[in-house]
Interface confidence: low
């Protein structure tokens, strides 16, 4: 990682964001706008692995916008910028931005789908389904097997959702995914089915679906 | 213009020391990540050392321990300080300059020949 | 011996095409950029191609470069006389910069 050798106390830390968004399907132009609280001079990106600067931009404004074009699944990772401003001595930069994940991928990874506290349940009781990702900031829906639309939808700033069943409508087989919130929508595989059951109702027949 | 100066270069006994200087002239030294890459007599390149914008220098594992990059940022200048000498170190060493694109290096010295004898 | 591997010789007639090869892993080439150098004799590299395929201002469009998977290839158009110079690809690998071996172009 890059430890500055500067004292960085008064430089305060741009933000680094993504447009159309952090999570993308392969040929997306990306741009990434990094953002100082101060106007400066010069930007750099930096991208994780990397021991040089990615890209650089000279402005005079407080943003500098970088753009990865037709990104590739290569190009995720893990990116941060900085800045430095004309007046300030050689080599002092400000401190890194927030690390921002870019993911370019066809298909996020399968969620996992528990109850919480358990798949046996008593009769009318509520039971509570945590279908959890690893990437937040996710749009989370719910499906009974057998029924063709969502039960819920959560948008969910944690990496997971819990989606709450009321009483006697619990029994039956489920399963989740996720999605990114908005365009280009890119959809994670489903999770494993999950069957739920009331205590010693027995092996209920119910449709795994895939 | 953008130009790069080795200097420093020239003969040297097995065992002993020698410390390459490149100024730099034509854009701003510090934003850049700055290397040494040497070249045998009839051999191909090979990189030696790097200087990042940020932290600490990084090394091929041949040279870990006997070279030392350093950069003066306010004189626009990168150092080599080689020590422990070897025949096998015998080469032409070029500075160079990495653009921002993953890691290339667009533009080089006209190297200064080191030489390792007795 | 280097990491990244070159044929150490490759040879041509004026107008030809000729291609270079350089083979890698996927710790090197396969996750990361590509880029070709010509060294004319007595004289120090230049850079022909980086980010696999992309030309710097001044380097003739004759000149491409491509990559697929854990290799690379320059490929020279249209060769002429000046195009003799041994050529090199180089990679990055966790922190350090591989070159391979060098290819000598002889343009017959």
């Known amino acids: 990682d890059f430890t500055p050798t500067a004292p960085l106390a008064s430089y305060p830390q741009p933000w680094l964001g993504a447009h159309p968004a952090a999570v993308v399907t392969p040929g997306i132009n990306v741009t990434l706008t990094c953002r100082a609280p101060q106007s400066a001079w010069r930007f750099a990106l930096f991208k994780s692995g990397l021991v040089t600067p990615l890209l650089l931009r000279d402005v005079s404004v407080e943003l500098a916008e970088f753009f990865l074009e037709e990104v590739t699944p290569a190009q995720g990772g893990s990116y941060h910028c900085r800045y430095r401003k004309t007046d300030w001595g050689p080599g002092v930069w400000s401190q890194p931005s927030n690390v921002l994940e870019l993911l370019v991928t066809d298909q996020l990874p399968r969620p996992s789908l528990v109850a919480l506290p358990g798949p046996v349940v008593a009769p009318g009781a509520n039971v509570s389904l945590r279908c959890a990702g690893r990437i937040p900031g996710m749009s989370f829906a719910l499906y009974r097997v057998g029924v063709a639309t969502p039960l819920q939808y959560i948008d969910s700033v944690q990496p997971w959702a819990d989606f709450l069943l009321i009483g006697t409508h619990t029994p039956g087989t489920y399963c989740c995914y996720y999605h990114t919130p908005s365009a280009p929508y890119v959809l994670s595989q489903r999770s494993q089915p999950l069957v739920i059951s009331f205590e010693g109702s027995g092996s209920l027949d119910y449709t795994q679906g895939n | 213009e953008v130009q790069l100066l080795e200097s420093g270069g020239g003969l040297v006994q097995p065992g002993g020391s020698l410390r390459l200087s490149c100024a730099a002239s034509g854009f701003t030294f510090s934003d850049y990540y700055w290397t040494w890459v040497r070249q045998a007599p009839g051999k191909g390149l090979e990189w030696v050392s790097g200087?990042?914008?940020?932290?600490?220098?990084n090394y091929a594992q041949n040279f870990q321990g006997r070279f030392t990059i350093s950069r003066d940022n306010s004189k626009n200048t990168l150092y080599l300080q080689m020590n422990s000498l070897r025949a096998e170190d015998t080469a032409v060493y070029y500075c160079a300059k990495a653009g921002f694109t993953g890691g290339h290096f667009d533009i080089w010295g006209q190297g200064t020949l080191v030489t390792v004898s007795s | 011996q280097s990491v990244l591997t070159q044929p150490p010789s490759a040879s041509g007639t004026p107008g030809q095409r000729v291609t270079i090869s350089c083979s890698g892993s996927s710790s090197n080439i396969g996750n990361n950029y590509v880029s070709w150098y010509q060294q004319l004799p007595g004289t120090a590299p230049k850079l022909l191609i980086y980010?696999?395929?992309n030309r710097p201002s001044g380097v003739p469009n004759r000149f491409s470069g491509s990559k697929s998977g854990t290799s690379a290839s320059l490929a020279i158009s249209g060769l002429r006389s000046e195009d003799e110079a041994d050529y090199y690809c180089?990679?990055?690998?966790?922190?350090?910069?591989?070159f391979g071996g060098g290819t000598k172009l002889t343009v017959l």
């Open positions: 980010g696999n395929s």
């Open positions: 200087s990042p914008v940020f932290g600490a220098a």
């Open positions: 180089q990679s990055y690998d966790s922190s350090s910069w591989l």
